[in-house]
């Protein structure tokens, strides 16, 4: 049994880091493998992660961690029974993938303005809480070409757009994702999408 693709990990910078790797053949990850991790700090305890299958030869492990700080560094080692397959390290602050925003809501009752709001996925005491910026994706269910991205570079988790920038009388969907420039993170996953029917009064044309 050998590791084909070494574990790569990303942290949500709160409580979970996710590591993925590939073995050289079909593997029952949960029965055959264990991923060990230990914070490089005074008297830290070692922890065992039981991986799940992620495709035939792929494995994924969700490492539970206490509140992460930028200096944290973990040793990782992958075991198959008594055999050490791989040894490495992981610094969560250097491999951050933020949590996806939640509770995306489209408010259509504000005159002819659409107000999209969502929730910041972090509690106020987390460093990322005040460092997230967002991308909002809006698309038409009827017209695949009607697809747009709005970059929200301010901290408030909301976006206002004129309803008239979208076509009237058709259904749209929206979703949002986050990233943090301070840690050069990857983008989060997209939030679940929300749907609304776009309708607004066309301005009366005078001839």
């Amino acid at each position: 049994m050998k590791v084909l693709q070494e574990p790569t990990c990303v942290s949500d910078y709160m409580s979970i880091s996710t590591c993925e790797w590939k073995m050289n053949g079909p593997t029952n990850c949960s029965t055959e493998l264990r991923l060990l991790y230990q914070l490089v700090f005074l008297l830290s305890e070692a922890h065992t992660c039981i991986p799940e299958n992620n495709g035939g030869a792929g494995c994924v492990c969700h490492l539970l961690m206490d509140d992460v700080v930028s200096a944290d560094n973990y040793t990782l080692d992958l075991w198959a029974g008594q055999q050490l397959l791989w040894k490495g390290s992981f610094k969560p602050s250097e491999h951050v993938k933020p949590r996806a925003p939640g509770n995306l809501t489209v408010h259509t009752n504000v005159s002819d303005t659409l107000l999209l709001t969502w929730s910041n996925p972090y509690p106020p005491d987390n460093y990322l809480y005040n460092h997230l910026t967002y991308a909002v994706n809006i698309w038409s269910e009827n017209d695949p070409a009607d697809f747009r991205i709005y970059n929200v570079t301010y901290l408030e988790p909301s976006l206002r757009i004129a309803a008239s920038t979208l076509k009237s009388g058709i259904s749209y969907r929206a979703r949002v994702r986050a990233w943090a420039q301070c840690y050069n993170t990857t983008w989060s996953e997209w939030s679940p999408s929300t749907k609304w029917h776009n309708s607004y009064r066309e301005p009366f044309e005078q001839h």
């Epitope: 264990r34 230990q38 005074l42 008297l43 830290s44 070692a46 065992t48 080692d77």
Partner: antibody, heavy 117, light 107 residues
Framework: EVKLVESGGALVQPGGSLKLSCAAS????????MSWVRQTPDKRLELVAV????????YYPDSMKGRFTISRDNAKSSLYLQMSSLQSEDTAMYYC??????????WGAGTTVTVSS | DIQMTQSSSSFSVSLGDRVTITCKAS??????LAWYQQKPGNAPRLFIS???TLETGVPSRFSGSGSGKDYTLSITSLQTEDVATYYC?????????FGGGTKLELK
């Protein structure tokens, strides 16, 4: 050269108190965790207490909680162990150790504590 | 707490012998194990970490091995300066605990 020199060991009566000191030199004291480990007369080693580099974090095994207090003065490169309500089972050689993470990297020569009436 | 057992508290050995000292943990340690050497009248000295990694200055006749709950410190050819007591220590979980020690004595 890293050097740790313990002092303060003595003969003390049961129920008494004692403060041990450890003078450190040869390394940047305020960058390292430190600990006290004791060796009983039957030569068994036991962890007594640990303190982080800045003094913000301390750890005591359950058997040591309440009677022992570890502290440090980074300005003086010194480590301390305040011991109270001493019993005969606390009789031991007490070692000051430098601990980077998980093991005891450097040990002093030790100081002897004898609890007896 | 994890219990560390060194089954032989002492060994009678001769110079040039191959010596094996064992340490058994009450739980699997996945190599979170250190060895210390203590010569008479001296403090312990860190000798091996991570079950197999020799610390700086440790002679190559020493080696560490093992996995799971069972670990071994070996000396290929015993020298006079190796006569000492050897302790194992786990760092899988707090409180970190030591074995009772194995004392090497010349026949």
């Amino acid at each position: 050269e890293v050097k740790l020199v313990e002092s303060g060991g003595a003969l003390v009566q049961p129920g008494g108190s004692l403060k041990l000191s450890c003078a450190a030199s040869g390394f940047t004291f305020n960058s390292y965790g430190m600990s006290w480990v004791r060796q009983t007369p039957d030569k068994r080693l036991e962890l007594v207490a640990v303190i982080s580099s800045d003094g913000a974090y301390t750890y005591y095994p359950d058997s040591m909680k309440g009677r022992f207090t570890i502290s440090r003065d980074n300005a003086k490169s010194s480590l301390y162990l305040q011991m109270s309500s001493l019993q005969s089972e606390d009789t031991a050689m007490y070692y000051c150790t430098l601990i980077t993470t998980w093991y005891f990297d450097v040990w002093g020569a030790g100081t002897t504590v004898t609890v007896s009436s | 707490d994890i219990q560390m057992t060194q089954s032989s508290s002492s060994f009678s050995v001769s110079l040039g012998d191959r010596v094996t000292i064992t340490c058994k943990a009450s739980e699997e340690l996945y190599n979170r194990l250190a060895w210390y050497q203590q010569k008479p009248g001296n403090a312990p000295r860190l000798f091996i970490s991570g079950a197999t990694t020799l610390e700086t200055g440790v002679p190559s006749r020493f080696s560490g091995s093992g996995s799971g709950k069972d670990y071994t410190l070996s000396i290929t050819s015993l020298q006079t300066e190796d006569v000492a007591t050897y302790y194992c220590q786990q760092y899988w979980s707090s409180p970190y605990t030591f074995g009772g020690g194995t004392k090497l004595e010349l026949k």
